[in-house]
């Protein structure tokens, strides 16, 4: 089996308030099966931003068509960015189970929010 890697190519992304932020994430293997989730922050206080298994997440859309059976691109776009959205975002693969368990995390992408241009 090819070992699954999670690639978040951007260490940081800067977006003006009110715009959309694209956070990139690709995986290198479909296995083990289980959902992809995005979180802001780490540890017990982290905030769920997107879960492939459930929805909807009104401000979040996937960049690619995740219903394709071979899809490995789980990049997301977050609309109408505000300063409260600033933080480090992690793309995380979960392995199926009862409950699903965290399998591997991307390195994270830091989102910074610039003031809305006047």
């Amino acid at each position: 089996e090819e070992e699954l890697q999670i690639i978040q190519p951007d260490k940081s992304v800067s977006v003006a308030a009110g715009e959309s932020a694209i956070l990139h994430c690709t995986i290198t293997s479909l296995f083990p099966v289980g959902p992809i989730q995005w979180f802001r922050g780490a540890g017990p206080a982290r905030v769920l931003i997107y879960n492939q298994r459930q929805g909807p997440f009104p401000r979040v859309t996937t960049v690619s068509e995740t219903t394709k059976r071979e899809n490995m691109d789980f990049s997301i776009s977050i609309s109408n960015i505000t300063p409260a959205d600033a933080g480090t975002y992690y793309c995380i693969k979960f392995r199926k189970g009862s409950p699903d368990t965290e399998f591997k995390s991307g390195a994270g992408t830091e989102l910074s929010v610039r003031a809305k241009p006047s």
């Epitope: 479909l30 083990p32 298994r53 459930q54 219903t67 199926k96």
Partner: antibody
């Protein structure tokens, strides 16, 4: 409520073609992958084909590849199955089904009967 | 191919377990589908190994481990008489496969 209603079933002769339709309502059709499943008389369920939410990617069981074509029209909330070169073995009730995020099924139509007979 | 028993029987109130084997836990998700008569619309009772749709009674539960999945009906009722099909989605082949079905008889 989610509703899937198949139509287009008929009695046809071997070698002829038929197009089945599935009208979807009660959910955002363009967000879901869809599948066709059939059941021959006295037999079990058999998955035939699936299609991604946007319609760009299709998947087939080997026995119908090249003869059957799955397609969709998201503007009409409709799923289709074009069946060519029909044989007696294609006699079955044909169901459309909505896929879950991981390509199983959550909602089913009532089915439409296709009879291939000379 | 997914393998399940051809038939099981139980008295009302008993617990029934139907197994489905032949998938690979690493790459397969399982679902269970109830069909009360041939040609009638199947009803999803479990998908994603253990997820029960909101309109399905809580006596239905699912689990998966190793190369097998199990549908459990705790406190079976007469109205649960049906054929139960397991299905698997294999992420290696992108193909869905059904078992041959298990006829549940409630005595």
């Amino acid at each position: 409520d989610v509703q899937l209603v198949e139509s287009g079933g008929a009695v046809v002769r071997p070698g002829e073609s038929l197009r089945l339709s599935c009208a979807a309502s009660g959910f955002t059709f363009s967000s879901y992958a869809m599948s066709w499943v059939r059941q021959a008389p006295g037999k079990g369920l058999e998955w035939l084909a699936g299609i991604s939410a946007g319609g760009s990617d299709t998947y087939y069981i080997d026995s119908v590849k090249g003869r059957f074509t799955i397609s969709r029209d998201n503007s009409e909330n409709s799923l289709y199955l074009q069946m060519n070169s029909l044989t007696a073995e294609d006699t079955a009730v044909y169901y459309c089904a909505r896929e879950t995020w991981n390509h199983l099924f959550d909602y089913w139509g009532l089915g439409t009967l296709v009879t291939v007979s000379s | 191919a997914l393998t399940q028993p051809a038939s099981v029987s139980a008295n009302p109130g008993e617990t029934v377990k139907i197994t489905c084997s032949g998938g690979d836990w690493y790459s397969t998700y399982y679902g269970w589908y109830q069909q009360k008569s041939p040609g009638s619309a199947p009803v999803t009772v479990i998908h994603s190994d253990d997820k029960r749709p909101s309109d399905i009674p809580s006596r239905f539960s699912g689990s998966a481990s190793g190369s097998a999945a199990t549908l459990t009906i705790t406190g079976v009722r007469v109205e649960d008489e049906a054929v139960y099909y397991c299905a698997g989605y294999d992420g290696r082949t992108y193909i869905n496969t059904f078992g041959a079905g298990t006829t549940l008889t409630v005595l």
